[in-house]
């Protein structure tokens, strides 16, 4: 009876999410393997988040709007482990917008989800950021490593979206 009601609840939750995401990929987790954590297909998952790499070349503002329509934001990178996971799926000859910008050009960087910008947990390439006119951040491969660079926001780039996992 308990299992039946839990299944019914799950199905109704799945139906609710289906209007936003036609397909979800779920895995069982939790100490009793009773919880399901899901990401939209074909997003990838890491820890408590889902990630989507958009190969559409768009400005930073349009990229953020595009993520927003999918219930996500441009990616906020909190740890080196998270960055290492993300970069496994990136092409080394491409650049991807992050959810990091400096709209006034005062070198006051801010994350799209209002996560405080912590200078100690940043992965700028050497010598970056280097221009007050370059007010948006990308991640790209340079000098044998992945790192961040400030670029013009209006220049179209690929992008990475991030959202919280869906728990059902």
């Amino acid at each position: 009876n308990f299992m039946y009601s839990k299944t019914v609840k799950r199905l109704s939750k799945l139906q609710e999410y289906q209007q936003y995401y036609p397909s979800l990929t779920c895995v069982m987790e939790g100490k009793d393997m009773e919880d399901w954590s899901c990401c939209p297909t074909p997003w990838t998952s890491f820890q408590s988040s889902c990630y989507f790499i958009s190969t559409v070349m768009q400005s930073w503002t349009k990229s953020q709007n595009n993520c927003s329509v999918m219930g996500a934001d441009l990616v906020v990178i909190n740890t080196k482990e998270e960055q290492d996971f993300i970069t496994q799926n990136l092409k080394i000859n491409s650049a991807y917008f992050l959810g990091l910008s400096d709209p006034k050009g005062w070198r006051h960087w801010q994350w799209v989800d209002q996560t405080p910008y912590n200078k100690n947990v940043t992965f700028w390439h050497s010598g970056e950021p280097n221009s007050p006119d370059e007010r948006c951040a990308i991640i790209n491969f340079r000098s044998e490593e992945w790192g961040w660079n400030d670029v013009h926001c209006h220049v179209p780039q690929k992008s990475i979206c991030k959202m919280k996992k869906i728990y059902i």
């Epitope: 400005s59 910008s101 006119d133």
Partner: antibody
């Protein structure tokens, strides 16, 4: 006082080349992105190319890509536009313009007087 | 590319009256309260001159008779009251994404 002075325009045959120059003064040239914008006779404004302050970024519309090259010499406070394989439709007044960044975009806050390019046989 | 459509193509206004020019973008040029639409005035034989930046900010030295408003896709330049030396072509321009694009222009004539 900010000044932008274009030169190098003239009459050229189709398929020919021209190099336009823009001499900048009255501001720290190396700190600003610059653009070329053109205006065909009796027509509206058309952006032609952009170069970032540090020379790291150049951008062109499809109509001139592969034929025009924008460059700058910050030591000489000068902006250039090398125009090759010129066509009749490139006939226009060419303006150099300074870009001023605002939030996620920019606008053109100062313009030169323009130099006229005529492509005709 | 973002297409900017200006209307009307031309208008004739008497001195002291109000002139209103609209610019419609094919997609939004706004982001979180910032509107990346700008307006220029061009008199015959002269280069364009910046009037308004970011939809509503008056460029230094431009008379307060000029004002701008709008958001997302619809923007307006208003001249009130119009003076004789306002006869010119007026252009809108967006910069939210490359390539930067201009409207086709509006010719303002003084009756």
């Amino acid at each position: 006082e900010v000044q932008l002075v274009e030169s190098g325009g003239g009459l050229v045959k189709p398929g020919g080349s021209l190099r336009l120059s823009c001499a900048a003064s009255g501001f720290t040239f190396s700190s600003y992105g610059m653009s070329w914008v053109r205006q065909a006779p009796g027509k509206g404004l058309e952006w032609v190319s952009t170069i970032s302050s540090g020379d790291s970024y150049t951008y062109y519309p499809d109509s001139v890509k592969g034929r025009f090259t924008i460059s700058r010499d910050n030591a000489k406070n000068s902006l250039y536009l090398q125009m090759n394989s010129l066509r009749a439709e490139d006939t226009a007044v060419y303006y150099c313009a300074r870009q001023l960044y605002y939030s996620y975009g920019y606008y053109f806050d100062y313009w030169g007087q323009g130099t006229t390019v005529t492509v005709s046989s | 590319d973002i297409v900017l459509t200006q209307s009307p193509a031309s208008l004739a206004v008497s001195p002291g009256q109000r002139a209103t020019i609209t610019c419609r973008a094919s997609e939004s040029v706004s982001f979180h309260g910032t509107h990346l639409m700008h307006w220029y005035q061009q008199k015959p034989g002269q280069p364009p001159k910046l009037l308004i930046y970011a939809a509503s900010n008056l460029e230094s030295g431009v008379p307060a008779r000029f004002s701008g408003s709008g958001s997302e896709t619809d923007f307006t330049l208003t001249i009130n009251p119009v003076e004789a030396n306002d006869a010119a072509n007026y252009y809108c321009q967006q910069s939210i994404e490359d390539p930067p694009t201009f409207g086709g222009g509006t010719k303002v004539e003084i009756k």
